[in-house]
Every structure is written in C-alpha cells, then in structure tokens.
C-alpha cells in the first residue's frame, strides 16, 4: 500500500516555544500566585504539596486528591483571574465596600483588538449586569476623580502585579478603596473579543453592520476571516452567520478597496497603483511615515494631488507572535510553493493557525498567528468589577465570580454571585432580578435591533457592485417593508397601554418638551415638568394622520415646529397639520445605500446632525439638505456610543442613544462628547417602578 | 492632606551607603505606590526606582546592583538605600506618590557626596 | 530602556504667545505620558496625566496630547510664572524614564 504523506515540519523564525517548566514547577508557581502556598519555592518534593493542592482543589469544586492529577494540572493551566483564591493581594485600607451607590469608572486606556465604542459598551454592560441587582449606579467619568479606573496593561503596568503574555492570568482587579483600590486591569497581551473570535465590522451588505461570523461558510468552504473570494473587484466580505450558503446574510469587511480613514481622501477608497515620491505603490505602504502606520492615495498620483487616507486594520487579519505581531495576514500568500488564501495550520506540529505577513512566506519568513476566538470582554469586565466591588471568587463553577475563564451566552450571574453581592449592597430597587439576557448573552455589538428586524437590506457602496461570480452576495430587495395596520386601543386598560410593559421603542422623541415614546402605532407623552406626568397612550393615527403607524425615528425643529418622521428610506414632515411626504430619502442628498434614519439631534444656526447606523452627515433643517461632504463615522463625533443604536434623540441638551432596552446618554464636556450615564429607558427616562 | 517628607544624612563619604527615610501622610501606603527621584545639581530628573502597594519593587536597571526599597506600612514610611556612592551620585533626592503620574512630591533632600 | 527625547532644551517665548514643547519615545508607550513643571528651587509638580488630562488645580492654558511615541504639552497663552522646566515621562515599562526637559524662558 502506498505510504501515507507525512507532514512537512518547518522552523518559523521567532517561533517562541511555551515554558519549560516542569508539571511541579508549574504547579508550585501557580499555588504561590494565587494565595495557595507563603513560598514560592518549595523543596520540589510532591508530599509537601499535597496540603496546597487539597485546598486547591476545594476551592476549584476539583475532586480533592491531593495529587497533581490531570484534572488538577488542567485546572492549572486555564486562562482565570489574576486576584489571588487564598487570602488579598495585600492588605487593604478599609472594609472593602463602597460607602456609597454612585459608582464613577474612568476608561483610561484601550486595547487595539476591539473597536473603542464596543470597548465602551462591554464596560457599561458588564456594569449593567450587577446595578441590575444592586441599588448601584455606574456613571462614566474622564480623570482620576474615578472611583474605578480601568487600563490595559502589559508586563509590569504599573501596580507591582506584573501580566504574563498570551492567556494565563487574563485581569485583576482590587478591592473598594481610595488609589489602586477598586482599579481593574486587563492583559493586553490576550486578544479581547466578544468571546467568539476576532469582531469585525461590515458595511453595506444585507445584514445591518452586523458583525462577520466566523467561520462562516460560503460555497461548502469554511472560512475564519473574510474572503475576496467570488468577487472581482477586491473588497472582502464576509457571512454574518455561520452559514452563508443557506441565510445569504453579509456585509462588507474593512478595507482599503471599501474606504479610507481621517486623512484628507474624504474616506475614499485607495487607488491600486498610485504615485508616491516618483515611486508607484500596489498596496497601502508606511514609506515616508515614523508610526507604522499603513497608508495609500486615494488619486493615482500622490505627488501631484496630495490626497490620502489612512488604511483600515481588520481584527480578524492581524496577527500576533511570529516575527510580524500586529501586522496583516497578506492573501493569498505562498508557502512552501502553494498559495493560501486563509490562515493555516500547514507545517505547524502544534496544530496553531499561522498566515503570511507578505505575499511570498518561502522569499520573505514574515509570519504570525492567526486570531483565535479571544476571550470575551464583557464576562472578564464583569468578573473584574465584582472585586472592585468587593466580592471575592467563589467555588462555584457556574458563578460569574470563579476564578476559571469560562465563556457562555447564558446570563452570567449565578445565586452565588447574587448572594455575594446583596450581602455588600442589599437589593436593587428595580424589579428585573438579574439582568436582561441582551445585557448577559454576549451580543454581537451591531446585530440588527429588536425594532430593526425587518429591515431591507443596505445597498452597496456608491459606485454599483461588480458583477460577481456566481454565489457571491448580491444586494437584496429595497422596499420598505409595508407598515402594519393601526389598531385603537381598547375601552379597558390593558397591559399593552403600559409603556413600562414595552421592551423596545419604535422611537423616542422630544417633541414640545415631552419625550414621546413611540411604539406600534401608539405612543406616550411624558414630561418631567413640575413632577413626573405620563400621558397616554395615544394612536399616531389620529394625531399625525399621513402617517403610517410603524416609524424609525422622528425629530422636532422646535422654531418653525416642524416634526420631521422617518421610516426606512422615507421622510414626512409635519408644520402644524398640513404634511409633505412621503420624501424619499435621496432627495435629502443621501446616496441611495441609506434606508434608514437612526436620528437626528439639532445644533445652532439652523441645522442638525443626521445619523444613519454608524455614520452621520450635517443637515440643514431649512433646505432638508445634506451637505455631503460632511459625512463622518459616528465613533469620531461620538465615542463610546453603540454603533448599531437603533433610535437617537436630544432631550435637554444631552444626546440619548438607545440601544435595546438601554440609552447611552452623551454631554458636551471640555469641548468633546462623553457618554456620561447608560441606564435603561423604562426604569430612568420614563421613571417606571 | 497629602504630604511626602524625606530625611537624609546632607553629607555622604565616597563609597559609603545612604539612606533615606520618607514619611508619607494623608494616604496609605497600601493605596499608592512610591517613587524614588533624585536630580543632580543643574541636571534632569532620573527615575531611580519604585516600591508598589503590595511590596513588589522595580529599579533603574543601571542602579540596581547598589539600590533597596523597602517600606512599613504601618508607620507610612518608605526606606531607600544605596551603597557605594560616588561623586556623581550628588544630587537631591524625592521621594513621590505615583498614581497615573506622580502626582505629590516631597520637598526632596539634598546629598552631596565628598569626602 | 525607553529613551524619551525632548528635542528642544529652551524655548524661549513672550507673555500672551502660544508655545508647544514635544517628546518623542523610543517606542510605542501608548498614552502613558505625563508632564511636569519644575520651578527654579522647587519639586516638580505634576500637570498632565494619561499624555492628556489635566492634574486637579491646573489653569486649563496648559493641554497634552499625543499616543504611541509623538507627544506634545502646549500653554495656550504663556503667563509670567509659566517661566520653569518641564519634563516628560513615561510609566508604560519600568524603569521609567524622563525626557532631558524643556527651559520655557520668557523674552
């Protein structure tokens, strides 16, 4: 019989092997790290062991053998916390509980891995997860004056308790208190996800900006990052569920082919080739730059037209280790004389997903790891702030607050956790017992919201699709979905005319001083004018009668008293009773890819800025006109906020951005919008019970 | 209110050791780490070392071999020692609070290195 | 170990003028830059933080900016008694280290 093909081996260069310590060196180092032990070295001798791994053992809920068994060994070498089982890190000022309920956390640094708004978001949510059972509040502050800083840190950062690399001690965090107390760190050596690897963004496509799914699969091939395959013109996309064969949903992934960042191309996408200093470049180049940073024209000729922008870095491409750490995976790229147009674990022993840096790995040796599935930001956030308030692990292996990373979808706190935290804290005032599972289930940061289920698909970049091969995404229908129809409410009162019974507004507007809560046909007026006054629920029917019952968002123009409605990729305006529209968005000096008006919030002189999903342009209320050249990326206007927010409205000078049962609500401050409160919109705006 | 106190020998003879005590107040040394600083005469600032809440300690690498950090936390005081002065070790020596930066110094002291 | 490079030793400015001093790092310290102003006699007093927060009591005429390696500490309207040295630092990698400092005089 034929041999079977042996693997073929190679040496990578800068390959750094794991430690070489032995199973008792490493288990001896971990019982003095984690309180277990008093010295870190002991005689090596297995019996003088057995009492530390008994305790161990017990507090892991491992079976108690004494031994260093594999189950125990197993236990040793999981990604967990750094804060130690046994006893503090050291020992702190005071009782180790905060002495009062408005908790302030500063984020004063970020991680490269994620973008910075979904960073924002997993610290209000993981936040969220113990105000939902506490009578705490959380409140987002710039500077010192917080009461819980968070940073990410490598090595020695800054506190005496030093990180580790890639996966062992993930973060730590310290107890209530004044200075390092309370403070929570996190290893930026790890690669911080949503716990479901590398999160990546799209664009266009028919899923909403919802985030690429990986591996998806496409055509009966799985694919872990995003593939120019079945296309012709370059731009990567990506399935944003597991399998794009059957549910068609996709989106465009970040690219130099899609579009540019700051810069000044207007966001344009590159030019492939362009002029630079005589020179023609192929690709985004760093030349005649001192950061590292990858740029490109987005003219053919630099030289002359001084037009560039900076190229967008994609989570799912960059690599780590190697000899190339935080460069790109370069597709296809050729290894051992074959091409590759994904990662691979070709010529690993250990079975590790590697890519390229270049187009040629045998010419070149530029290489790194692939992305893995990261660990999820807001379960190890949410582990950390539990000891920043207070709480230490627990032996529970269901419990939030045990030491072991564990990811699920689940709602993450256990009795246990609750337990813990009503003893520091007693109950929350608010009726949900454990938070919503949005806030718990890791959500991916820009799946379509509740209200946005039947949205049409986007349509791609200005421009037109090339036509792709067979297979490939193809832009969806463009319709509006057809409005449901508008139903009375009944004589009797029913649950339904609660709006604290409502899970998501349709919208939410300040429309003469009182916010109005839309939703299905109806809506609520409430006002905080001289004690809280709710009225309602009203039927838009006969309020606003050209109006259909379903909307998306609706904005007043307070000096004229013009109500602007917006539903899909259509506008109504309202001056009194006489109605114009329904407009068709385009007409407002927005490409035909918007179909969907998130909000608009008004600034001085007559103008307003519009936002749709992630980007907004400024708008002149007068003219109903666009300026097109304005448009920007809702992240540079507005930090922090969640990029798939679903409804946007100013009310009393501060902007609301709703997502879910949430708002992220942003202040002017120091001449930048800060996200300065997240709350949900029952319980906080409309003061629900 | 914060305040950070250094208390040093003035004078030093070449090859001999130095110690300084610095007495902190308004804080805990369990809540702030501290740094030593010194500057010679007319000349920058040189970081020298760094004792962390939990007693872990950090040095400059080119002093390391000569310098100690040591602490007790239950009378606020922070100890450093250097052995083998020379000349150029003439300079005034702080001691400050570290959080994010050093955000208290103390009014430093001066040690001259002769014979 | 992190050399941090403060290009100009003195500066000289007028009352009333705009002055911005930089700081280059020998590699990328992300935003753990701060600065300090050291008048003539006295300890150095920190002023910004975290390469761009202003230090409780500062007049907001003194801003930082700058990540990974390019800093920059700016006096929007230089004052008499801004006449000191200011020197960076950064506490991303022990040891930590300072720039050789800036001399901010007043012509």
């Known amino acids: 019989a034929p041999h079977q093909r042996q693997p073929t081996y190679v040496v990578f260069p800068r390959d750094l092997k794991t430690s070489n310590l032995t199973d008792t060196q490493l288990a001896e180092d971990y019982l003095y790290r984690y309180g277990y032990t008093r010295a870190a070295q002991m005689m090596g001798e297995k019996q003088s062991l057995r009492p530390a791994l008994l305790m161990l053992q017990k507090q892991l809920s491992l079976p108690q053998t004494g031994e260093l068994d594999s189950e125990t060994l197993k236990a040793i070498r999981s990604p967990r916390c750094g804060v130690p089982d046994v006893g503090k890190f050291q020992t702190f000022d005071g009782d180790l509980k905060w002495h009062h309920h408005n908790i302030t956390y500063w984020i004063q640094s970020y991680t490269e891995d994620l973008p910075r708004d979904v960073i924002d978001d997993s610290f209000a949510r993981a936040f969220a997860v113990w105000s939902a059972v506490t009578p705490l509040t959380f409140t987002r502050v710039y500077g010192l004056e917080a009461d819980i800083v968070i940073q990410f840190g490598v090595a020695e950062h800054g506190d005496g308790y030093p990180f580790d690399g890639k996966d062992g001690l993930l973060a730590h965090a310290f107890p209530p208190g004044p200075g390092i107390q309370g403070d929570a760190h996190f290893d930026d050596d790890e690669l911080w996800s949503l716990g479901k690897g590398a999160v990546v963004p799209t664009y266009f496509g028919n899923a909403n900006g919802a985030p690429c799914h990986f591996p998806f699969t496409f055509e009966g091939r799985s694919y872990l990052s995003c593939t120019t395959d079945g296309r012709n013109d370059g731009k990567p996309w990506c399935g944003t569920t597991a399998d794009y064969d059957t549910d068609r949903k996709y989106g465009f992934c970040p690219s130099e082919n899609l579009y540019t960042e700051h810069g000044n191309g207007d966001g344009k996408p590159c030019v492939f080739p362009f002029i630079f200093e005589g020179h023609s470049y192929s690709a985004c180049t760093t030349k005649g730059r001192s950061d590292g940073y990858r740029w490109c024209a987005t003219t053919a000729n630099y030289d002359q037209d001084k037009a560039d922008g900076f190229c967008p870095t994609r989570a799912d491409v960059t690599v780590t280790g190697g000899n190339s750490a935080g460069e790109m995976c370069v597709f296809p790229f050729v290894f051992l004389g074959k091409q590759y147009s994904t990662c691979t674990s070709e010529g690993r022993s250990d079975g590790r997903l590697w890519c390229a840096t270049t187009s040629n790995f045998d010419a070149d040796k530029k290489w790194g790891f692939c992305p893995d599935q990261g660990y999820s930001l807001f379960l190890v956030a949410a582990h950390e702030f539990g000891h920043a308030l207070g709480l230490d692990h627990s032996s529970v292996p269901e419990a939030l607050m045990y030491p072991m990373y564990h990811y699920h979808e689940d709602s993450p706190l256990h009795e246990d956790d609750i337990k813990g935290i009503h003893h520091l804290y007693g109950r929350g005032s608010k009726p949900d017992p454990r938070p919503p599972a949005t806030t718990a289930a890791e959500p991916q940061p820009t799946a379509p919201p509740t209200m946005c289920s039947t949205a049409p698909p986007m349509a791609y970049p200005t421009g037109g699709p090339t036509v792709a091969p067979t297979g490939a995404p193809s832009p969806g229908p463009t319709g509006p979905p057809t409005a449901g129809p508008s139903e009375a409410p009944t004589e009797s009162s029913t649950p339904d005319d609660n709006p604290c019974n409502v899970d998501v507004f349709d919208a939410i507007a300040d429309i003469q001083g009182a916010l109005h809560f839309f939703k299905d046909g109806r809506y609520w007026k409430f006002s905080n004018h001289g004690g809280n006054q709710l009225q309602g629920p009203f039927l838009i029917a006969r309020t606003w009668p050209a109006f259909p019952s379903k909307l998306n968002s609706a904005f007043e123009d307070p000096q004229p008293k013009k109500i602007f409605f917006f539903l899909w990729a259509q506008m109504w305006v309202y001056t009194g009773q006489s109605v114009l529209g329904p407009r068709s968005l385009d007409k407002l000096g927005l490409g035909s890819e918007v179909t969907l008006v998130t909000g608009l919030l008004p600034r001085r002189g007559g103008k307003a800025l519009l936002i749709s999903r992630e980007r907004i342009w400024k708008f002149d209320l007068k003219s109903q006109k666009v300026d097109p050249q304005s448009v920007t990326r809702l992240d540079n206007e507005f930090s922090g906020v969640p990029w798939n927010s679903h409804n946007v409205f100013q009310y009393q000078d501060k902007a609301y951005f709703c997502h879910d049962k949430y708002f992220w609500r942003v202040s002017f401050h120091n001449r930048v919008n800060q996200v300065d409160h997240v709350a949900y919109v029952t319980y906080d705006l409309l003061q629900c019970p | 209110q914060v305040q950070l106190k250094e208390s040093g020998p003035g004078l030093v003879a070449p090859s001999q050791s130095l110690s300084i005590t610095c007495t902190v107040s308004g804080f805990s040394l369990l809540s702030y780490g501290v740094h030593w600083v010194r500057q010679p005469p007319g000349k920058g600032l040189e970081w020298l070392g760094v004792?962390?809440?939990?007693?872990?300690?950090n040095y400059n690498s080119a002093l390391m071999s000569r310098l100690s950090i040591s602490k007790d936390d239950s009378k606020s005081q922070v100890f450093l020692k250097m052995n083998s002065l020379q000349t150029d070790d003439t300079a005034i020596y702080y001691c400050?609070?570290?959080?994010?930066?050093?955000?208290?110094w103390g009014q430093g002291t001066s040690v001259t290195v002769s014979s | 170990d992190i050399v941090m490079t403060q290009s100009h030793k003195f500066m000289s400015t007028s009352v009333g003028d705009r002055v911005s001093i930089t700081c280059k790092a020998s590699q990328d310290v992300r935003n753990t830059v701060a600065w300090y102003q050291q008048k003539t006699g006295q300890s150095p007093k920190l002023l910004i933080y975290s390469s761009s927060y202003r230090n409780t009591g500062v007049p907001d005429r003194f801003t930082g900016s700058g990540s990974g390696t390019d800093f920059t500490f700016t006096i929007s309207s230089v004052q008499a008694e801004d006449l000191a040295v200011y020197f960076c630092q950064q506490h991303y990698i022990t040891p930590y280290t300072f720039g050789g400092g800036t001399k901010l005089e007043i012509k």
């Open positions: 004792i962390w809440t939990g007693g872990t300690t």
């Open positions: 400050a609070r570290y959080y994010y930066g050093m955000d208290y």
